[in-house]
Interface confidence: low
């Protein structure tokens, strides 16, 4: 469930503290409920950048776990189609700390509406 | 030991501040293009221990046309379905990577 996703995000936050990753990532900080799946897709895609740039197996594994888990939950809710939403590349780029904070917020949105 | 000039990436530029070993540099997508979500602009000067030659790692960067500019032309509305985002997992390797 989404609680497991939160715990994996917390682990990623913990693991990156000792690393210098200066990447900026597409971040939706004000998610509209009718575009939450689209926004979640962008977060999951950008998470792979953290995995790639960290070079850390533990981060890679945690990212992979999180993506698989989130995809399982999304697909179990059926094929939801959203239109009129921003593409990932239209979003503002923010630092990793802000990205992860916004990611936690969107997961909480999913928890609150499930 | 230093790295040679980095490879070119389509629709991107790089201004290298340092060619020394372990330097980390970033490509920047050209005007009118954006980094494709999920790709990394990072390249690092690393040493090939077998040959003792330094080289830049290959970035996963893809620069795509800025969707805001593309939208100025008539185009179908952007839609998304819940098909999954697929990670590219590393396979288990028989030896540790440093």
């Amino acid at each position: 469930n989404w609680v497991n996703v939160i715990s994996d995000l917390k682990k990623i936050e913990d693991l990156i503290q000792s690393m210098h990753i200066d990447a900026t990532l597409y971040t939706e900080s004000d998610v509209h409920p009718s575009c939450k799946v689209t926004a979640m897709k962008c977060f999951l895609l950008e998470l792979q950048v953290i995995s790639h740039e960290s070079g850390d197996t533990d981060i890679h594994d945690t990212v992979e776990n999180l993506i698989i888990l989130a995809n399982n939950i999304l697909s179990s809710n059926g094929n939801i189609t959203e239109s009129g939403c921003k593409e990932c590349e239209e979003l503002e780029e923010k630092n990793i700390k802000e990205f992860l904070q916004s990611f936690v917020h969107i997961v909480q949105m999913f928890i609150n509406t499930s | 030991i230093t790295c040679p000039p980095p490879v070119s990436v389509e629709h991107a530029d790089i201004r290298v501040k340092s060619y020394s070993l372990y330097s980390r540099e970033r490509y920047i997508c050209n005007s009118g293009f954006k980094r494709k979500a999920g790709t990394s602009s990072l390249t690092e000067c690393v040493l090939n221990k077998a040959t003792n030659i330094a080289h830049w790692t290959t970035p996963s960067l893809k620069c795509i046309r800025d969707p805001l500019l593309a939208r100025q032309r008539p185009a179908p509305p952007f839609t998304v379905t819940t098909a999954g985002v697929t990670p590219q997992p590393e396979s288990l390797s028989p030896s540790g990577k440093e």
Epitope: L15, I68 | L92, E98
Partner: antibody
């Protein structure tokens, strides 16, 4: 070539603190996590905890109050400290390297610890 | 915590026979994060299968893993003399990581 080797006391008295060291080679402790697992005589394997590449730790709740895992990356060593040892803690203690999918692809040969007065 | 129950406790078979070992989880093992290890007397465990069905490096292909959710199986298609050992399953779906109690495969 990846190797892990546990070292420490063979005999520990009840209430004493056990300190075991896992010395590794062939991989970097800043990249790969190391798990500690134990196996009482004739029994199953029991996971104790893990120290991640970045230094954070996860422990089995059953041992959380008396277990500490730390590392000295410069010496390529991981240290397990377990306080208030009891005869039921008599076991072979293993350290093992973490791999993708949270499995242990390389193990030390194990060190047998007996808790007795 | 997730409890893994292995069956049978002991499997008595002859070389050349097929061995089927079961591992049942008390809750669903998400992402099929289940592994199998082989342990011989006086030795450390050796990784055989990871992610339920992927063969670890250097492991002969007579070993295979299958299953998802709560039911997992390790199959040894044709037992070789060196395959007689104890086999453990292990999960990482949630903390703490847990192992099954083991299945001993002995020579009949």
């Amino acid at each position: 070539q990846v190797t892990l080797k546990e070292s420490g006391p063979v005999l520990v008295k009840p209430t004493e603190t056990l300190t075991l060291t896992c010395t590794v080679s062939g991989f970097s402790l800043t990249t790969y996590a190391v798990h500690w697992i134990r196996q009482p005589p004739g029994k199953a394997l029991e996971w104790l905890g893990v120290i991640w590449g970045a230094g954070s730790t996860d422990y089995n709740p059953s041992f959380m109050s008396r277990l500490t895992i730390s590392k000295d990356t410069s010496k390529s060593q991981v240290v397990l400290t377990m306080t208030n040892m009891d005869p039921v803690d008599t076991a072979t203690y293993y350290c093992a390297k973490n791999a993708a999918y949270y499995v242990m692809d390389y193990w030390g040969q194990g060190t047998t610890v007996t808790v007795s007065s | 915590e997730i409890v893994l129950t292995q069956s049978p406790g002991t499997l008595s078979l002859s070389p050349g026979e097929r061995a089927t070992l079961s591992c049942r989880a008390s809750q669903s093992v998400i992402y099929s994060y289940l592994a199998w290890y082989q342990q011989k007397p006086g030795q450390a465990p050796r990784l055989l299968i990871y992610a339920a069905s992927k063969l670890a490096s250097g492991i002969p292909d007579r070993f295979s893993g299958s299953g998802s959710g709560t039911d997992f199986t390790l199959t040894i298609s044709r037992l070789e003399p060196e395959d007689f050992a104890v086999y453990y399953c292990q999960q990482r779906a949630s903390y703490p990581l847990t192992f099954g109690q083991g299945t001993k495969v002995e020579i009949k």
